[in-house]
């Protein structure tokens, strides 16, 4: 009679994490009598995975009924596979012996690889806001995938970016891997509505990549442009001075009016108008009682935007150009009329 052979037909199998793995093994003879054992690995360090005769192996079930007299199928099913289960599994036939069974023949082994999906990519931007024309860095991280091969791409508003560096860790063997990528993005004034997208493609995702996004609205600061203008008002001795604050982002803005360098009023922006590009406009105005002034007046609109150093724009009000009211020298009254800021775009 021909000598028993242990046949493991699958050289390798690949299983998704969480699923069951079936490891096939058949023998070609019922002789010699003795049990089958399954090991992960070979040599003195191999790990026992299943023993037909004894032991408790809660995740392992046999495919066939091993109690049947002429059973020759010793395939096993391992449930709830994790990346830690990867390795080469050997089906080993033992010959009955006393006191111990004696190893008789081993199958050629089945390499089990475990596919694990990457976690949803998390994109994070810089801690502080930056202004247009500056380059900022975004990071993207995804974890827990196997095998190691993975593809990562960056996009800004659908356009692929090329300035990025990607690392997959660890460099050596591991049950699962992580990817970390840093992309550099140049900001423009139009980026308030822009998005940066990190896209991860992996064999486990069946062609449907995972995406992580970051809104540039969280990153960008568009400083305002200021314009101070004056228009005459009906009353001869009053002038309307407006400060147009245009194209700024984010909304946080405080405006201070100064009269010849002295603070006259401070207000916080409200009732903003939003532009198509996501930036905001705001206007503040003052009624200036010209008759209250003997000399020219320097009016300054000072804006502190998003906690940044203040920017200002000044306007010289020529007092000589306006006729003065009688008695203005003795009882000038308030130089600046108490005017609420006007909403509206400039």
């Amino acid at each position: 009679e021909e000598e028993l052979q242990v046949i493991q037909p699958d050289k390798s199998i690949s299983v998704a994490a969480g699923e069951s793995a079936t490891l096939h093994c058949t023998v070609t003879s019922l002789i010699p009598v003795g049990p089958i054992q399954w090991f992960r690995g070979a040599g003195p360090g191999r790990e026992l995975i299943y023993n037909q005769k004894e032991g408790h192996f809660p995740r392992v079930t046999t495919v066939s009924d091993l109690t049947k007299r002429n059973n020759m199928d010793f395939s096993i099913r391992i449930s709830n596979i994790t990346p830690a289960d990867a390795g080469t599994y050997y089906c080993v036939k033992f010959r009955k012996g006393s006191p111990d069974h004696v190893e008789f023949k081993s199958g050629a082994g089945t390499e089990l690889s475990v596919r694990a999906k990457p976690s949803a990519p998390v994109v994070s931007g810089p801690a502080a806001r930056a202004t247009p024309q500056h380059t900022v860095s975004f990071t993207c991280e995804s974890h827990g995938f196997s095998p190691r091969d993975i593809t990562l791409k960056w996009f800004k508003n659908g356009n692929e970016l090329s300035d990025f560096q990607t690392n997959v860790d660890p460099a050596g063997d591991s049950v699962s891997y992580s990817i970390h990528s840093t992309a550099k993005v140049v900001l423009t004034r139009e980026d308030v509505h822009s998005q940066v997208i990190c896209e991860v493609a992996h064999v486990t995702l069946q062609g449907d990549p995972l995406r992580g996004t970051a809104n540039l609205s969280e990153t960008i600061r568009v400083p305002p442009t200021l314009e101070v203008t004056q228009q005459p008002v009906r009353a001869e001795n009053q002038v309307n001075v407006t400060c147009q604050v245009r194209k700024f982002y984010p909304q946080r803005l405080q405006l201070t009016w100064l009269e010849n360098g002295n603070v006259s009023r401070t207000e916080t922006a409200s009732t903003l108008t939003e532009n198509k590009d996501g930036t905001y406009n705001w206007m503040s105005w003052l009624l200036v009682n010209v008759s209250a002034h003997r000399d020219d007046v320097k009016l300054t609109c000072q804006v502190e935007h998003d906690g940044q150093p203040a920017v200002s724009k000044s306007h010289d009000l020529k007092v000589s150009a306006h006729p003065k009211e009688q008695g203005s020298n003795t009882a000038p009254g308030p130089a600046l009329a108490s005017a609420a800021p006007l909403g509206g775009s400039g």
Epitope: G41, A42, R46, V92, F104, A108
Partner: antibody, heavy 122, light 112 residues
Amino acid sequence: QVQLQESGPGLVRPSETLSLTCTVSGGSIRNYYWSWIRQPPGKGLEWIGFIYYNGRTFYNPSLKSRVTISLDMSINQFSLKMTSVTAADTAVYYCARVRAYSGIGLDGTDVWGQGTTVTVSS
Amino acid sequence: DIVMTQSPLSLPVTPGEPASISCKSSQSLLYSNGYAYLDWYLQRPGQSPQLLIYQGSNRASGVPDRFSGSGSGTDFTLKISRVEAEDVGVFYCMQALQTPLTFGGGTKVEIK
């Protein structure tokens, strides 16, 4: 192909600890045993011990009390630490890969580092 | 521990001629699965050892077919069918059946 590179100090003082690292490049740690073997000047080869990729270690009983082999798969390195060294530990130390295809035995030490000379002297 | 004994200690050879080295183990290296766990290595002068034969008779990848291994149980032989100048060095046998792995004392092959 797979290459092994030993690194560590060439001179160790008596009673101190010898520490060597072997870096594996061009291949996987998985499914192999990773061995340390030494050769005193003008003498034969002596097996120190090895570690399997699953972390199981095996040591030469004559050195077991002084030897620790560890493995860091994430950086493809394994290490040897030998405490309380004496002049008798002066040798060329080799790191090597051992194959295991079936059964309880081993199927050849098929890749060797170039060896690093360690001298124990005060 | 399994003790490995090699002979001869030194082997002067003539290029083109055959050569033979013996290795004996203190216990059988033939495992119940039918494999004999014995390796042969060549250490050329100033180099690391190189695997020639594993499991008693299997030639390692890239090893010339002039090298062959035979034997089972406790007696093993390495044969070189036609010695070449590059074969000089020390040949070692090693048992790979159980730990501690043990080497023979080595056979120094040199050109006559």
